[in-house]
């Protein structure tokens, strides 16, 4: 159904990292425009990206209102010169997205090692707490603020002179590990949300190695 020469959107896909959330779809419009609506299960649909020729719509502002809700978006197609025109059912053509629950599904961005400090046989590695676009009391929350103890970090570390990797885990943003005095180590970290069924792990952070030109203390 639908107005002649107007086609429904398809391949609706959520792209979301650290709660920055974009809905993408096809096709590139020919003589048509799109409007997006988003709603939680309440059915209170909110329109966004009015009459756009883009094939993406930033829905971050809506999903960050409650990242634990499940959202559905729908993309309406209208003839380019006549957005009042409707299909044979008296409604514009539209397609629904998959359901999306940000808390369970947003990709966790690549973590960054903020600093490392060695004191004798102890090495402290601190992971930078990435900020999100989720707000509370007018301030942006960090990943740790949002996920709390649901978020853990895994540290992979090894002696620069060998390839045998060891791992450590923390539910804070700091690791304190035992190392051999006088040895240089390399390490990277990965964010993990063990309770998830999808998108459980981030990509690994860039590898940092001690004893390089940046020195043993890096901020």
């Amino acid at each position: 159904s639908g107005t002649t020469n107007t086609v429904a959107a398809y391949n609706l896909t959520w792209k979301s990292t650290n709660f920055k959330t974009i809905l993408e779809w096809e096709p590139k419009p020919v003589n048509q425009v799109y409007t997006v609506q988003i709603s939680t299960k309440s059915g209170d649909w909110k329109s966004k990206c009015f009459y756009t020729t883009d094939t993406e719509c930033d829905l971050t502002d809506e999903i960050v209102k409650d990242v634990k809700q499940t959202y559905l978006a729908r993309v309406f197609s209208y003839p380019a010169g006549n957005v009042e025109s409707t299909g044979s059912a008296g409604e514009p053509l539209y397609e629904n997205s998959p359901e999306f629950t940000p808390y369970l599904e947003t990709n966790i961005g690549q973590p960054v090692i903020q600093k490392y400090e060695q004191g004798g046989t102890k090495l402290k590695v601190t992971v930078k707490d990435s900020f999100t676009l989720v707000r509370r009391n007018n301030t942006f929350l960090s990943l740790r603020d949002v996920f709390g103890k649901d978020l853990i970090y895994t540290l992979y570390y090894w002696k620069s002179s060998s390839s045998g990797k060891k791992t450590a885990k923390t539910n804070t943003n700091e690791f304190l590990i035992d190392v051999d005095k006088g040895e240089n180590y390399c390490f990277s970290v990965q964010a993990v949300i063990p309770s998830r069924t999808v998108n459980r792990k981030s990509t690994d952070s860039p590898v940092e190695c001690m004893g390089q030109e940046k020195g043993e203390f890096r901020e």
Partner: antibody, heavy 118, light 107 residues
């Protein structure tokens, strides 16, 4: 566990009024659209009306527009259907149902019977 | 309004049988279709939404397929508790409409 309990049905004369209630529990009521569906004796299902979680959006089947009003009180976790100018053809079991996104009906009450007869 | 036509209106089958019920919409509804089961004197129960998504708690012997105008509900191996009436419902546009029902009876 989601529970929906309808009440307010009964026998009413043609032209009369009735108010159905549906008490909801086991979920965050305001987070869901809700609907009324009816079933005449020995017949199939007929969608009657839906309302969004905020109550800002309401929808009706043509045969009840102007006669029935759907509403909700989120502070009381209760859905209502005010039925005026009742007709014999409104005789049915009325079910309230939870309706994610105002679409399908994922949980149903046990129903309440409305009989319109003189 | 979108008309929903189910077939067959009634069906006799035995436990263990594979059963398919079809539902046709009078115009395209994409995948905006749900299936319900109703037993005598009981409220309907949700089985399938979005044409093929299984409602939580529903046995995996139930499955749905289709898009556009033609849809099917399949029960892979009938169990005694599956004898009931089945309804499809479109939620593409208001007013939402149901099929007339398919009564599944014991042969």
């Amino acid at each position: 566990e989601v529970q929906l309990l309808e009440s307010g049905g009964g026998l009413v004369q043609p032209g009369g009024s009735l108010r159905l209630s549906c008490a909801a529990s086991g979920f965050t009521f305001s987070n869901y659209a809700m609907s009324w569906v009816r079933q005449a004796p020995g017949k199939g299902l007929e969608w009657v009306s839906s309302i969004s979680g905020s109550g800002d959006y309401t929808y009706y089947t043509d045969s009840v527009k102007g006669r029935f009003t759907i509403s909700r009180d989120n502070s009381k976790n209760t859905l209502y259907l005010q039925m005026n100018s009742l007709r014999a053809e409104d005789t049915a079991v009325y079910y309230c149902a939870r309706s994610p996104w105002g679409y399908y009906l994922d949980s149903w009450g046990q129903g309440t019977l409305v009989t319109v007869s003189s | 309004d979108i008309q929903m036509t189910q077939s067959p209106p009634s069906l006799s089958a035995s436990a263990g049988d594979r059963v398919t019920i079809t539902c046709r919409a009078s115009q395209g509804i994409s995948s905006r279709l749900a299936w319900y089961q109703q037993k005598p004197e009981k409220a309907p129960k949700s089985l399938i939404y979005a044409a093929s998504s299984l409602q939580s708690g529903v046995p995996s012997r139930f499955s749905g397929s289709g898009s556009g105008t033609d849809f099917t509900l399949t029960i892979s191996s009938l169990q005694p508790e599956d004898f009931a009436t089945y309804y499809c419902q479109q939620y593409n546009s208001y007013p939402y409409t149901f099929g007339q029902g398919t009564k599944l009876e014991i042969k």
